[in-house]
Interface confidence: medium
């Protein structure tokens, strides 16, 4: 009778974008079948997947945050067939560029200000505020009471993903004014927003310079 | 090589639906918020909606809420705009564009657009 | 929202000289601008981000400068493919863009 079989890793939490991920159904078994199922599905061809020694090895060359699984493989010969246990991927990636929520850039004198930061990122991300270049505080919310136009200036969120090594940022600028009217209503409609600004964070640019040049 | 390919324009009457696609290749779609862009006959670019890397976020243009749907499936890496209750003011051509990745969201790559006409 | 004007429709120019384009903000943006050049018949293609910064492969005629309010796409020793117009983008409000009206460059 054919063993049930199981899936070994040589990487069970690969880096979005850099690792590859080679999995391997054992133990070895003369004259059988090999099988690969992801998502209950039967594996579908794509460049980034590859299987060798007798389809035993499925090679993910490239993951994505989408390749989390999970696998599963099976063996079979002419007289039985036998499916793993399922393998989910920890596929970190991350931090997607960030969101500052609420939308609004424009505050009265002696409001509230009450700023999110929210990144998509595999593991969750450690956030920090700079305001006007300099490191205030490592939460994901901002929070200043009664705002006046010493306020004004970038309020960038700045977040950091150990696991991938990577960071991210984005910066909006905020003015505060003393008049009594609020600012109108704008043409443009969201639950959060945030800005770009490059110049903040000098290591950054070593990043983007890979894409982008001065 | 980054590539976005739209499709799905056409001419539709005013109260019409049209569903536009874009597809993506030669990038980590997964990792990018997604945005639609559209040109009036005027020459006049405007921005219409964006939808982040995971699709928990999303953000219209406030002429279009409630009318045009953003969405993207990320296993197929293709983006969407489901468009109804089209009025002669939503003809242009629309582009689907990439907001670039480390803290510059200025959009870096953009499609070849597909044009939308509505007029009965 | 924030309005991108780009008071100067269009810009007449001869192969050699210098031209800038402008574009003035109705509020504090920062340096978070974009500059994009359109050829008939063609999609936007971006030029400049964060209001001087170059992409890879843009020819190095091209400077953006300015930051706040007031923008500036210089282009020096026009060349004949450089006949296009020219669109600013602010993100500062990111996701939600306003784009300039556009100037047009014509070659004389």
């Known amino acids: 009778e054919l063993p049930k079989p199981y899936i070994s890793s040589n990487n069970s939490n690969p880096i979005e974008d850099k690792d590859a991920v080679t999995l391997t159904c054992e133990p070895v078994a003369e004259n059988t079948t090999y099988l690969w199922w992801v998502n209950n599905q039967s594996l579908s061809v794509s460049p980034r997947l590859q299987l060798s020694n007798g389809n035993r090895i499925l090679t993910l060359l490239s993951v994505t945050r989408n390749d989390t699984g999970p696998y599963e493989c099976g063996i079979q010969n002419s007289e039985s067939a036998k499916r793993s246990d399922p393998v989910t991927l920890n596929v970190t990636y991350g931090p997607d560029t960030p969101i500052i929520s609420p939308p609004d850039l424009s505050y009265r004198s002696g409001a509230n200000l009450n700023l999110s930061c929210h990144s998509d990122s595999n593991p969750s991300p450690q956030y920090s505020w700079l305001i006007n270049g300099t490191l205030r505080q490592h939460t994901q919310v901002l929070f200043i009471s009664k705002i006046t136009s010493n306020n004004n200036g970038a309020y960038a969120c700045f977040v950091s993903n150990l696991a991938t090594g990577r960071n991210n940022s984005i910066v909006k600028n905020i003015s505060v004014s003393s008049g009594d009217s609020a600012p109108g209503s704008s043409g443009l409609s969201a639950s959060g927003s945030g800005s770009g600004l490059n110049d903040i964070f000098e290591a950054q640019k070593i990043e983007w310079h890979h894409h982008h040049h001065h | 090589e980054v590539m976005l390919v739209e499709s799905g324009g056409g001419l539709v009457k005013p109260g019409g639906s049209l569903k536009l696609s874009c597809a993506a290749s030669g990038f980590t779609f997964s990792s990018y918020a997604m945005s639609w862009v559209r040109q009036t006959p005027e020459k006049r670019l405007e921005w219409v909606a964006t939808?982040?890397?995971?699709?928990?976020?999303?953000y219209y243009l406030d002429s279009v809420k409630g009318r045009f749907t953003i969405s993207r499936d990320n296993a197929k890496n293709t983006l969407y705009l489901q468009m109804s209750s089209l009025r002669s003011e939503d003809t242009a051509m629309y582009y689907c564009?990439?907001?670039?990745?480390?803290?510059?969201?200025?959009?870096?790559?953009w499609g070849q657009g597909t044009s939308v006409t509505v007029s009965s | 929202d924030i309005l991108m004007t780009q008071s100067q429709k269009f810009m007449s120019t001869s192969v050699g000289d210098r031209v800038s384009v402008t574009c003035k903000a109705s509020q504090n943006v920062g340096t978070n601008v974009a500059w994009y050049q359109q050829k008939p018949g063609q999609s936007p293609k971006p030029l400049i981000y964060s209001a001087s910064y170059r992409y890879s492969g843009v020819p190095d005629r091209f400077t953006g400068s300015g930051s706040g309010t007031d923008f500036t796409l210089t282009i020096s020793n026009v060349q004949s493919e450089d006949l296009a117009e020219y669109f600013c983008q602010q993100y500062n409000s990111y996701p939600l863009y306003t784009f300039g009206g556009g100037t047009k460059l014509e070659i004389k």
């Open positions: 564009a990439r907001p670039a990745y480390y803290g510059n969201p200025a959009m870096d790559y």
């Open positions: 939808i982040s890397s995971g699709g928990s976020y999303i």
